[in-house]
C-alpha cells in the first residue's frame, strides 16, 4: 500500500505575534498531504487545513476564542490521492505539537510611536494601540484591551546629540517626560509583559526624533 511512503510531521512550531497564530511543521510533502487538528486540554478536536500540501496552518480563528486557554495541535499525514488510507496501526500517522497558551506565549509585535508633542520642557509620547484579531462582541480588541495592566511600555529616549539612553515606563499608552529646553530628543518604545517568564519584550519601535514630521512643538 501507499502508506509506507507516508512520514509523520516533525518540528511542529507555533509562530504567533499579537495573537496571529500559525502552526508550522516539516517536511515539505512528497506524495502526501496534511490535516491539522486543534483542541483545548478539555475540548474536542477541530480539524483545519484539510488535506493541504502546505507546511503551515493558520489557527488564529481558533485560539482567539479564548487566548488564556492552553491549546494542543496535531498534524496528520495522509498519502496523496488516497486520504482514506491509514497507517499500519489503522490510524493515520500524526505528530503532536507542543502546548501553546496564547496569552503567555504570543510574541509582542513591534510597537509604533503614534505621536509626540512638546509643551515647554515636557514631552507627551503616545504609543499606537495596535488592533489584534481577538474579538469581543463582534469588535476587534486592541493589545491594551487584551492584556490590560499586564502590558507596559518602556520608552527609551535620548538627546539627538548623544547616545546614552534614559527610560520611562507606563501601563497606559502615553508617557509624559521631562526634557531639556532647546534640545532635540529621539524616542523608541518597547512593549513588555513583566508577568511572563519568556517572550517578555517586543522588538523596539522605529526611532522617532523631534524635528521630524510625527511630532508637534509648542513653546510655552
Amino acid at each position: 500500500s501507499g502508506t509506507t511512503n507516508t512520514v509523520a510531521a516533525y518540528n511542529l512550531t507555533w509562530k504567533s505575534t499579537n495573537f496571529k497564530t500559525i502552526l508550522e511543521w516539516e517536511p515539505k510533502p512528497v506524495n502526501q498531504v496534511y490535516t491539522v487538528q486543534i483542541s483545548t486540554k478539555s475540548g474536542d478536536w477541530k480539524s483545519k487545513c484539510f488535506y493541504t500540501t502546505d507546511t503551515e496552518c493558520d489557527l488564529t480563528d481558533e485560539i482567539v476564542k479564548d487566548v488564556k486557554q492552553t491549546y494542543l495541535a496535531r498534524v496528520f499525514s495522509y498519502p496523496a490521492g488516497n486520504v482514506e488510507s491509514t497507517g499500519s496501526a489503522g490510524e493515520p500517522l500524526y505528530e503532536n505539537s507542543p502546548e501553546f497558551t496564547p496569552y503567555l506565549e504570543t510574541n509582542l509585535g513591534q510597537p509604533t510611536i503614534q505621536s509626540f508633542e512638546q509643551v515647554g520642557t515636557k514631552v507627551n509620547v503616545t504609543v499606537e494601540d495596535e488592533r489584534t484579531l481577538v474579538r469581543r462582541n463582534n469588535t476587534f480588541l486592541s493589545l491594551r484591551d487584551v492584556f490590560g495592566k499586564d502590558l507596559i511600555y518602556t520608552l527609551y529616549y535620548w538627546k539627538s546629540s548623544s547616545s546614552g539612553k534614559k527610560t520611562a515606563k507606563t501601563n497606559t499608552n502615553e508617557f509624559l517626560i521631562d526634557v531639556d529646553k532647546g534640545e532635540n530628543y529621539c524616542f523608541s518604545v518597547q512593549a513588555v509583559i513583566p508577568s511572563r517568564t519568556v517572550n517578555r519584550k517586543s522588538t523596539d519601535s522605529p526611532v522617532e526624533c523631534m524635528g521630524q514630521e510625527k511630532g508637534e512643538f509648542r513653546e510655552i
Epitope: 507596559i152 518602556t154 520611562a168 507606563t170 523608541s188 518597547q190
Partner: antibody, heavy 121, light 107 residues
Framework: EVQLVESGGGLVQPGGSLRLSCAAS????????IHWVRQAPGKGLEWVGF????????GYADSVRGRFTISADTSKNTAYLQMNSLRAEDTAVYYC??????????????WGQGTLVTVSS | DIQMTQSPSSLSASVGDRVTITCRAS??????VAWYQQKPGKAPKLLIY???FLYSGVPSRFSGSRSGTDFTLTISSLQPEDFATYYC?????????FGQGTKVEIK
C-alpha cells in the same frame, strides 16, 4: 538558581582601563535589564549605568559617561563594563544587578557578589 | 536628578524594638521606590519593591509604606540579623538614585 557573578576587578593605575564581567545563570539576560552599581569604600550606593541586552540600549551616570561602556553578549549570557580613563574616585566595589518590573515599578532582585576596583599609582 | 533624602543616617536600637526609616523624594516618584538591606562585605538584598510590596522570602516584620513623596521602611520587631545598613532607591526616572543609607546598630 539565579546567579550573577562579577569578575575582572583589580588594581589599575590612573588613566588605565579594566573590563568587568557579569556572568548570569538561571535566567536569560535578554529577558531582563542589567545595571551596574558601585560603592566606594565606606560610602553609599551609586548607579553607574544599565543595558537592555535585548536591544543593546545603554544609559550612564554623568560621572562615567564617555569613559565607561556597558555591553552584553547574549550568547554567553554575560554583561560587561568596560572602564577607560580610570580615576582615583572610581575606586569602589562594582556590582551588577538584575532589574525586573512589577507592573511599571522596577526593582533589582538579584545582585552579584561584587568585584573590587582600585585605581592607584 | 531626583534626590532621595534618607533619615536618620544611623540609629541604635535593641532587639525587639520597632524601627522606622524614612526617605523623602525631591519630586513625585509615584510608587517606584524599593528598599535594600546591606551587610558589611555583602551585596545589597531587596526587601521591599513598589513602595509597599514585600519581596519573596523577606520576613513579614519588614514593611513599607508611602505618603505622597515620603516613604517609610518599618521593622516591627528588630532581630539580631537585622543589624545592617538600609537604602531606599527610586526607579521613577533615569538616573535611578539611592538614599544615603541608614546604619542600624546595636544599642
Amino acid at each position: 538558581e539565579v546567579q550573577l557573578v562579577e569578575s575582572g576587578g583589580g588594581l589599575v593605575q590612573p588613566g588605565g582601563s579594566l573590563r568587568l564581567s557579569c556572568a548570569a545563570s538561571g535566567f536569560t539576560i535578554s529577558e531582563y535589564w542589567i545595571h551596574w552599581v558601585r560603592q566606594a569604600p565606606g560610602k553609599g550606593l551609586e548607579w553607574v549605568g544599565f543595558i537592555d541586552p535585548y536591544n543593546g540600549y545603554t544609559g550612564y551616570a554623568d560621572s562615567v559617561r564617555g569613559r565607561f561602556t556597558i555591553s552584553a553578549d547574549t550568547s554567553k549570557n554575560t554583561a560587561y563594563l568596560q572602564m577607560n580613563s580610570l580615576r582615583a574616585e572610581d575606586t569602589a566595589v562594582y556590582y551588577c544587578a538584575r532589574a525586573d518590573y512589577y507592573y511599571v515599578d522596577e526593582y533589582w532582585d538579584y545582585w552579584g557578589q561584587g568585584t573590587l576596583v582600585t585605581v592607584s599609582s | 536628578d531626583i534626590q532621595m533624602t534618607q533619615s536618620p543616617s544611623s540609629l541604635s536600637a535593641s532587639v525587639g524594638d520597632r524601627v522606622t526609616i524614612t526617605c523623602r523624594a525631591s519630586q513625585d516618584v509615584n510608587t517606584a521606590v524599593a528598599w535594600y538591606q546591606q551587610k558589611p562585605g555583602k551585596a545589597p538584598k531587596l526587601l521591599i519593591y513598589s513602595a509597599s510590596f514585600l519581596y519573596s522570602g523577606v520576613p513579614s516584620r519588614f514593611s513599607g509604606s508611602r505618603s505622597g513623596t515620603d516613604f517609610t521602611l518599618t521593622i516591627s520587631s528588630l532581630q539580631p540579623e537585622d543589624f545592617a545598613t538600609y537604602y531606599c532607591q527610586q526607579h521613577y526616572t533615569t538616573p535611578p538614585t539611592f538614599g544615603q543609607g541608614t546604619k542600624v546598630e546595636i544599642k
